[in-house]
């Protein structure tokens, strides 16, 4: 069987709109520590021509800078190519467009390869509901519970959201 989960049934357009980052995980803890290159937070997403466009919030000098990134579609439905701090093979692991999204990235920066996973939700008040699913995906790809960081409101650049 071909393993990877598919994109949402109604297409990527269903992922459009506001999202909130809830948890991050990586085999390289420095990447998701404060000021780590992957300690970034989703603000919103949209889809066009099969590509995913994301506005992310990056903490910088006590402020949060909004940056736009595009993950380009590939021949595999749930896989995207993203240039951010090197090259990333970005996979949509588990998607419920109305509730939560789990993605993971295999990042290659110079000669270093890392694995980073990200849980985002539509409604922050329900974040606890989706942490078990995130832990399960992380375990499946080889990231342990102690490699997961659950974000607080302070972490998330909440003040920078319009």
């Amino acid at each position: 069987q071909e393993g990877n989960h598919e994109e949402p049934q109604g297409g990527l357009e269903e992922l459009s709109g506001r999202w909130h980052s809830v948890a991050l995980a990586s085999n390289k803890s420095d990447l998701i520590k404060p000021w780590g290159h992957f300690r970034v937070f989703i603000h919103s997403m949209s889809a066009k021509d099969g590509n995913l466009h994301g506005d992310i919030l990056i903490p910088q000098d006590g402020q949060c800078e909004k940056v736009s990134l595009t993950a380009f579609k590939t021949a595999t439905s749930n896989k995207f190519d993203l240039e951010y701090w090197g090259h990333n093979d970005l996979y949509l692991a588990e998607v419920d467009p109305k509730s939560y999204l789990i993605l993971y990235m295999i990042n290659q920066y110079n000669d270093d390869t890392s694995l980073v996973a990200h849980l985002m939700v539509r409604d922050l008040s329900r974040q606890q509901d989706f942490l078990p699913a995130f832990e399960s995906v992380c375990e499946d790809i080889g990231l342990h519970k102690d490699q997961i960081v659950v974000l607080s409101d302070d972490d998330r650049c909440q003040g920078s959201r319009d």
């Epitope: 069987q1 071909e2 393993g3 990877n4 989960h5 085999n27 996979y91 692991a93 993971y104 295999i106 390869t113 694995l115 995906v137 375990e139 499946d140 790809i141 080889g142 990231l143």
Partner: nanobody, 122 residues
């Protein structure tokens, strides 16, 4: 400790198909991410494909994406590599490996098989 034994290699014509199997020993098979690597004559060993512990998630080298399919059967403690549309440049010794994390890097795999030869003739 996991022991891995590959089978299914052989000689095939370009455009043909071949299926490799890797049988593991030990009851901890589903604790491991499984991968396939290959080494062509005079070249370094390179990543081919990997599959997560449950089999839900896979990752492929660009060179084989769309042609090769990795799968696993945790009940049979076996991982498979189905290779279609083979090219002469796929000629190599193919190694099965067990590791901790879904990554395309040799160093993250702890256990290795002895390899099976795949030769694709033009």
């Amino acid at each position: 400790q996991v022991q891995l034994v590959e089978s299914g290699g052989g000689l095939v014509q370009a455009g043909g198909s071949l299926g490799l199997s890797c049988a593991a020993s030990g009851r901890t098979f589903n604790n491991y991410v499984m991968g396939w690597f290959r080494q062509a004559p005079g070249k370094e060993r390179e990543f081919v494909a990997a599959i997560s512990r449950s089999g839900s998630f896979t990752h492929y080298a660009e060179a084989v994406q769309g042609r090769f399919t990795i799968s696993r059967d945790n009940a049979k403690i076996t991982v498979y590599l189905q290779m279609n549309s083979l090219k002469p440049e796929d000629t190599a010794v193919y190694y099965c490996a067990a590791g901790a994390i879904l990554m395309p890097t040799e160093r993250t795999y702890d256990y290795w098989g002895q390899g099976t030869q795949v030769t694709v003739s033009s």
